[in-house]
Structures are given as structure tokens and as C-alpha cells.
């Protein structure tokens, strides 16, 4: 039975409906009672929708699929997928069985356009020729990952000193932040183009910088040079201080904490009042210490997503700012060791030893060694998967040929905390079972 689907992927915008076309040629006298139709995910074989015994068996895929029942008898087995999500992207197989059987797979390519980029400058005041400035271009809620291009006001590409990061949100849509560092000339235009490669959609913005002479007497803002390291779930203090002049009063103070890259507001103090947290209600100032020049920020119940740079802006009559980095960490659990096969082991057997350690951050370094401390680097495969909280589970697999006996040790290191967690397994020469039976 010949089943026909489009060769090219079906491109669908997030939130819209998509039709995955599939057709077959019914023979004369064909009736729907003879038809078995199954749509499933090609890779996982998960059932999506089916028609059997003359009846639509309904959606097995979040109630977002439908057939075209009036068209089935003419050989139209297409599937309608509603409110498309990023997670729907992939291959769907259409199985048709009458007397004979046929199948074909159709690809769904999900897309979402990127927003017009917003451009921010750091520093954004008192710029002079020769200053180094960081220009950030941010575009949101697109899919798939964007391509980003920078150029100057004459169309000359700017490829040096560009750092682009793309982060997916819970829906799988990407926010792109591209940072260009330039040394200012007399004046200049800087343009950022964000392209969606599937939609061939361009979003662009530009900024023109005209440096000028800056006034003297900027506020000196001090933060620690080294990153602040905080354990997940604990509280962290991001220190920031300034030197108040005699006669300084809090009514003169404008204090703003924001995320350095995205410029998202975190916390502010203006017009003599704490304006509160704009960051999930997990931040606080030290109000009793502000008058002495302590503008530090308390961040509670630290999460992996908090990691990054926070900028402390202080404005009294003059203005100053400085950025402090928050490095988040979480210790790794003591590794568990498993063997495969784990019974009747003999010298000469190939055995797979798996070392698993959980819920650490950032990604671990994994080292294997034998009972004499000799490193084992061949035949090691290590994978690290982040959970919803961003914490990593690490699984490292060592394949070895057993000797007469041997000890195999796995060390999982957290590179930020310099914390080591290790496990080992000893395999003896005679036939044995692991773990040893009581």
C-alpha cells in the first residue's frame, strides 16, 4: 500500500495549528471498517492518534490532534495538530493498513519569530572617544536558535569581540542576547541583525553613539572583584558600597540593582524609599546600612537561574556603577556504582562500570583510576543532564576487561566548590556476583 506524505518538513508557528498531510489510494469498494490508521512519533513510537474498527479512537497526544473524518474515505489520512508547541517538533509516522500495509514519515519543523531587538549600552553615560563600551542586543521568544550578525554604520561586519548566548524558556522558545564590545571612535552606528533561519525572518535594530566630554566627579562604586559563590537554596549577599559625602541623605539616593546582561530590574531604592524586589520577591537591601554607603543586596533561596552578573547603580548627584558576579554551586552526592553484567564475572570478561552522582552544579569533572591510582581514561563516556532546577546528574561509564582482581574508583569533582565525591568497586578474581550476596 502506497502512503504519501510531503517530502519537505511542515513548518508551523508556535501556537498555530498544523496539518501533517498523509494520503493513500483506496481501492474500489473500500470501506472505513477495513481501515486501520495509526499516527505515532517516529522515534519513540508514542501513539498520537488512531482510527480502527470503523471509528476514530481519538487523540492520545494531549487532546490536541484530530483527523479529517469526512475525508478518510477518499484516502485523506492527514492529522491536524492544534496549538503547536516547540516540543512537538520532530517526525510523525502515518501507518495505514487495509488489507496491505504502508507507512511514511512527515517532519514537523516548529518556528517562532524573534521580536525586534532592544539595544542597551554599558556604560550609557558620559561616553568619550577611546572608551570601551558594551552594546547588548536582545531579542525574545523565537525558535529555533537565531543567527546574529553585527555591522557598523557603513555595513562593515563586526565579528571580533562578539558574545552571543541563547537561553530557552520553559516553552522552549529562545531569548537571544548578543554582546558587542567596541572602542568608541568620534561617533558610530552599530547594528544588530537577528535572523530566524527557518522563517528567514530578520529583526534588526541599531544604535548611534555620539561620545561627548563627561563631567568629573562620578560616584565610586565598589564591589568584590571575585565572584560571590552561593550554594543552591542558601542566601547570598552581593556586596556593593559607595562613599557618601558629608550631609548625604537617603532622599538624594537612587540605587538600582539590575541584571547586567538583560538590564532586568532586580531591586531599587528611589525617592527616599525602598521600592522593593522586582525579582521574584527574593531580594532585600540592608536599609539600616544604606546611609553609611552600604548598597549590598541580599538574594534569598538562591537558584541556578540566578547565576550571572548583577550591576549596582548608585546615583546621588553624580553617578557610578559596578558589576558583581554570582556563581551558583551545589555539591554532588556520593557516587553510586553499578556493574553490568553483575553476575558470574570472570577474568577476561568485559564489564561496564557506571558511576552516578546527582544534583550538583555546575557541571562536574569526572576522573577514573584503578586500585594503584593509575588514571583510566580510555573507554570512558560521561554524560551530564540538567533537571528542571538546572542541577546536573552525572553518569560516567567505564568499560574494562577484568583482570585477576581490581579496584575501580570514580571521583566526581565540583570545580567551583573544589568538592570531591568518590565511589569505588572492587572486583575479585573468582566468579562473583555484584553486589556480593549476603
Amino acid at each position: 500500500l502506497e502512503v504519501q506524505v510531503p517530502e519537505d518538513p511542515v513548518v508551523a508557528l508556535v501556537g498555530t495549528d498544523a496539518t501533517l498531510c498523509c494520503s493513500f489510494s483506496p481501492e474500489p469498494g473500500f470501506s472505513l471498517a477495513q481501515l486501520n490508521l495509526i499516527w505515532q512519533l517516529t522515534d519513540t513510537k508514542q501513539l498520537v492518534h488512531s482510527f480502527a474498527e470503523g471509528q476514530d479512537q481519538g487523540s492520545a497526544y494531549a487532546n490536541r490532534t484530530a483527523l479529517f473524518p469526512d475525508l478518510l474515505a477518499q484516502g485523506n489520512a492527514s492529522l491536524r495538530l492544534q496549538r503547536v508547541r516547540v516540543a512537538d517538533e520532530g517526525s510523525f509516522t502515518c501507518f495505514v493498513s487495509i488489507r496491505d500495509f504502508g507507512s511514511a514519515a512527515v517532519s514537523l519543523q516548529v518556528a517562532a519569530p524573534y521580536s525586534k531587538p532592544s539595544m542597551t549600552l554599558e556604560p550609557n553615560k558620559d561616553l568619550r572617544p577611546g572608551d570601551t563600551v558594551t552594546i547588548t542586543c536582545s531579542s525574545y521568544q523565537g525558535y529555533p536558535e537565531a543567527e546574529v550578525f553585527w555591522q557598523d554604520g557603513q555595513g562593515v561586519p563586526l565579528t571580533g569581540n562578539v558574545t552571543t548566548s541563547q537561553m530557552a524558556n520553559e516553552q522552549g522558545l529562545f531569548d537571544v542576547h548578543s554582546i558587542l564590545r567596541v572602542v568608541l571612535g568620534a561617533n558610530g552606528t552599530y547594528s544588530c541583525l537577528v535572523r530566524n533561519p527557518v522563517l528567514q525572518q530578520d529583526a534588526h535594530s541599531s544604535v548611534t553613539i555620539t561620545p561627548q566630554r563627561s563631567p568629573t566627579g562620578a560616584v565610586e562604586v565598589q564591589v568584590p572583584e571575585d565572584p560571590v559563590v552561593a550554594l543552591v537554596g542558601t542566601d547570598a549577599t552581593l556586596r556593593c558600597s559607595f562613599s557618601p559625602e558629608p550631609g548625604f541623605s537617603l532622599a538624594q539616593l537612587n540605587l538600582i540593582w539590575q541584571l547586567t546582561d538583560t538590564k532586568q530590574l532586580v531591586h531599587s531604592f528611589t525617592e527616599g524609599r525602598d521600592q522593593g524586589s522586582a525579582y521574584a520577591n527574593r531580594t532585600a537591601l540592608f536599609p539600616d546600612l544604606l546611609a553609611q554607603g552600604n548598597a549590598s543586596l541580599r538574594l534569598q533561596r538562591v537558584r541556578v537561574a540566578d547565576e550571572g552578573s548583577f550591576t549596582c547603580f548608585v546615583s546621588i548627584r553624580d553617578f557610578g556603577s559596578a558589576a558583581v558576579s554570582l556563581q551558583v554551586a551545589a555539591p554532588y552526592s556520593k557516587p553510586s556504582m553499578t556493574l553490568e553484567p553483575n553476575k558470574d564475572l570472570r577474568p577476561g570478561d568485559t564489564v561496564t562500570i557506571t558511576c552516578s552522582s546527582y544534583r550538583g552544579y555546575p557541571e562536574a569533572e569526572v576522573f577514573w583510576q584503578d586500585g594503584q591510582g593509575v588514571p583510566l581514561t580510555g573507554n570512558v563516556t560521561t554524560s551530564q543532564m540538567a533537571n528542571e532546577q538546572g542541577l546536573f546528574d552525572v553518569h560516567s561509564v567505564l568499560r574494562v576487561v577484568l583482570g585477576a582482581n581490581g579496584t575501580y574508583s570514580c571521583l566526581v569533582r565540583n570545580p567551583v566548590l573544589q568538592q570531591d565525591a568518590h565511589g569505588s568497586v572492587t572486583i575479585t578474581g573468582q566468579p562473583m556476583t555484584f553486589p556480593p550476596e549476603a
Epitope: 550578525f149 555591522q151 561586519p157 535572523r195 541599531s206
Partner: antibody, heavy 121, light 106 residues
Framework: QVQLQQSAAELARPGASVKMSCKAS????????IHWVKQRPGQGLEWIGY????????DYNQKFKDETTLTADRSSSTAYMQLISLTSEDSAVYYC??????????????WGAGTTVTVSS | QIVLTQSPAILSASPGEKVTMTCRAS?????MNWYQQKPGSSPKPWIY???NLASGVPARFSVSVSGTSHSLTISRVEAEDAATYYC?????????FGAGTKLELK
Amino acid sequence: QVQLQQSAAELARPGASVKMSCKASGYSFTSYTIHWVKQRPGQGLEWIGYINPNSRNTDYNQKFKDETTLTADRSSSTAYMQLISLTSEDSAVYYCARYSGSTPYWYFDVWGAGTTVTVSS
Amino acid sequence: QIVLTQSPAILSASPGEKVTMTCRASSSVSYMNWYQQKPGSSPKPWIYATSNLASGVPARFSVSVSGTSHSLTISRVEAEDAATYYCQQWSSNPLTFGAGTKLELK
């Protein structure tokens, strides 16, 4: 109208130098970059480099960096390209072109008629 | 550097035929430009910013994009279209041209 007028053909011996010109008219010379493109007989187009007449910044294709110098004279709205240590490989037509457009899309909208350089002993 | 590969090198067509030539970039480009050149003449701007026709270019010319491949199509070839067509990018240094596709009329 916008024009780029290039200097006459040059006949030179191997090892010699030539300096050709590209005079702009009909627009603000300092507002756009001027690029130079090489085309050998029966061959395709090769980018040599560009000059920004306003800042006098230049950038070159590495392939041509050592044998080429680009300059511009704002008072006469003229761009120049000097080729040194000529070899037979330098026999070609050399075009100047204006890179124009608006952010972020640019292209060569105006081309000179080309200067033919023949290197022969 | 970004290499632009044009195919075919030579394209032969009869008047009224539909023809397509392709320019494939070795990596993503911000946009592509196309130029037409006839023997003994300077190149002329033909298509800019991937798909925009330059002034005076007939509407029978169009461009489609798939990944890093840019395809220039002439819906009905006319005698005046006989020329060499070059693609060009400047997303990163150096600026590069394709080797060209020569369109000949039968």
C-alpha cells in the same frame, strides 16, 4: 548622478608599481566606503579591500594585503589603489565600487568602468 | 572565510524557459547580494539583501532561500538575460564572491 570615474589603463613591467584612481561625484564621498575588486581575464570577481574615506580606516583581503595600499583624498573625492612588486598574476581589470544601502542591508550599487592593468616585460 | 559555491558554472536555456541557479554558502550569511555582468562591462547590482530587486531589474527574477542555499530563478528567460551572475556576502571578512554562473541562450 552618482558616478565613479576610474583612471586609464596601465602597462607596467614586472616588479614595478602602479597607482590608479577612482574619482567620486554626485554624492557625499565621506558617507560610503569605497571597495576595490579584481577580475582576471575570463575569471570571477575577487575582493581586494576597502577604505572608509571619512575615518580613512582600511581593511584588506589577506591575499592582497602585502602588495596593496588604499588611500583617499577627501578634498578631491578620490580614492586610490597602489599595487607594488607587480607580477603577471596582477594583470587584470580593477574596479572600484561604492558600498551603499541602509542598515542592515548593503551592496555595491555603483561601479567604476574599471582600470585595466597589463604586466609584461 | 565564507566560501560561496555557485552552480552550475554554465547554464544553457531557450527563451521563455524557467531557469534556476544556486549559490551555497559554507556557513550562515547575514544576507546575499547578486550582480549581473556582461562581457566588457562592469558588474551591475541585480538583487540585494537576499531577495530585493535592484532598480530596473525585471520582475521575472526572484530568489528563494533554503538553509545556506540561495537560488536565483528567472521565470521566463529573455535574450537580454544572457550574462554571468555573481553572488556576494560580507557577513565576515573577507568579503567574498561566488565564482559565477554564466547564462547562455540557445
